[in-house]
Amino acid sequence: MMTGTIETTGNISAEKGGSIILQCHLSSTTAQVTQVNWEQQDQLLAICNADLGWHISPSFKDRVAPGPGLGLTLQSLTVNDTGEYFCIYHTYPDGTYTGRIFLEVLESSVAEHGARFQIPHHHHHH
């Protein structure tokens, strides 16, 4: 049975040209995290493998930095970066947990971080 929950940075906003940290945290499970994938729609941004470290997809190498921790830093933001981002936790023996973050990139200088909130886990097994 999957008991874990993913806490994320929730709905966040940032200024065009700036940077933002996407962060998720898996709790309430003793499952081993084997890999975390960061995704935007059908695009794979990055993989953090527990044994092998980080792989940033070549499409994003110039604007994405690994970390902090299992998080991801997006740099040189544009309005086109507005949208949903997902952290996919691959775990053993539980399976897959998914967290969602919505990022809004603003033209103006008014950009505030949303509060952290929990998202129920998705029951995806491999």
Epitope: N37, E39, I47, N49, D51, L52
Partner: antibody
Framework: EVQLQESGPGLVKPSETLSLTCAVS????????WNWIRQPPGKGLEWIGY???????YYNPSLKSRVTISRDTSKNQFSLKLSSVTAADTAVYYC??????????????WGQGTTVTVSS | DIVMTQSPDSLAVSLGERATINCKAS??????VAWYQQKPGQSPKLMIY???YRYTGVPDRFSGSGSGTDFTLTISSLQAEDVAVYYC?????????FGGGTKVEIK
């Protein structure tokens, strides 16, 4: 340039343990990921597992109970042991390097492969 | 495990013509797909990674496309030296898995 060379017995008896070694030159096995992949005659590729730069291992769950991958950093080589073999383990066995940082799980350097036949 | 299904099993194309190989993943693998070329009696060679990026030294007649579950390797103008078996592979999650291969021959 990275070069990998497999070695080991070409014939193994059923129920025995298959043992192969991969000698690596031109690159240190304390960097990147070092893999074993096999190809049964006339069939596709099956990934067996890896040993990472730090010595951590991951095995394909389909073979996990029978597989051990280890390394000898002083000789810059890594090894595969597959126990309780059957005819279904007859294959060409490749050792391979994977540069995860640049290419993810895509394998960029392969050994020439060594044929292992399981037969009494 | 994620199953990678290639089609067709074999393909005969005239020299200079286009060859198209398809690969379908059993679940969404985003862009975590590689393609390999294996000539008779040789080990596989990496051709494409991250679905569409050519590996060092790969001729530009080879291109990869797709995301999600459907991927394509295209040889824009088949040359005699392209005769080989081509394999797709997913590395979205372990265990990394390969397709069954597509044999490309000259018509």
């Amino acid at each position: 340039e990275v070069q990998l060379q497999e070695s080991g017995p070409g014939l193994v008896k059923p129920s025995e343990t298959l043992s192969l070694t991969c000698a690596v030159s031109g690159y240190s096995i304390t960097s990147d990921s070092w893999n074993w992949i096999r190809q049964p005659p006339g069939k596709g590729l099956e990934w067996i597992g890896y040993i990472s730069y730090s010595g951590n291992t991951y095995y394909n769950p389909s073979l996990k109970s029978r597989v051990t991958i280890s390394r000898d950093t002083s000789k810059n080589q890594f090894s595969l042991k597959l126990s309780s073999v059957t005819a279904a383990d007859t294959a060409v066995y490749y050792c391979a390097r994977l540069d995860f940082s640049n290419y993810g799980g895509a394998v960029d350097y392969w050994g020439q492969g060594t044929t292992v036949t399981v037969s009494s | 495990d994620i199953v990678m299904t290639q089609s067709p099993d074999s393909l005969a194309v005239s020299l200079g013509e286009r060859a198209t190989i398809n690969c379908k993943a059993s679940q969404n693998v985003r862009t975590a797909v590689a393609w390999y070329q294996q000539k008779p009696g040789q080990s596989p060679k990496l051709m494409i990674y991250s679905a569409s990026y050519r590996y060092t030294g790969v001729p530009d007649r080879f291109s990869g496309s797709g995301s999600g579950t459907d991927f394509t390797l295209t040889i824009s103008s088949l040359q005699a030296e392209d005769v080989a078996v081509y394999y797709c592979q997913q590395y979205y999650t372990t265990p990394w898995t390969f397709g069954g291969g597509t044999k490309v021959e000259i018509k």
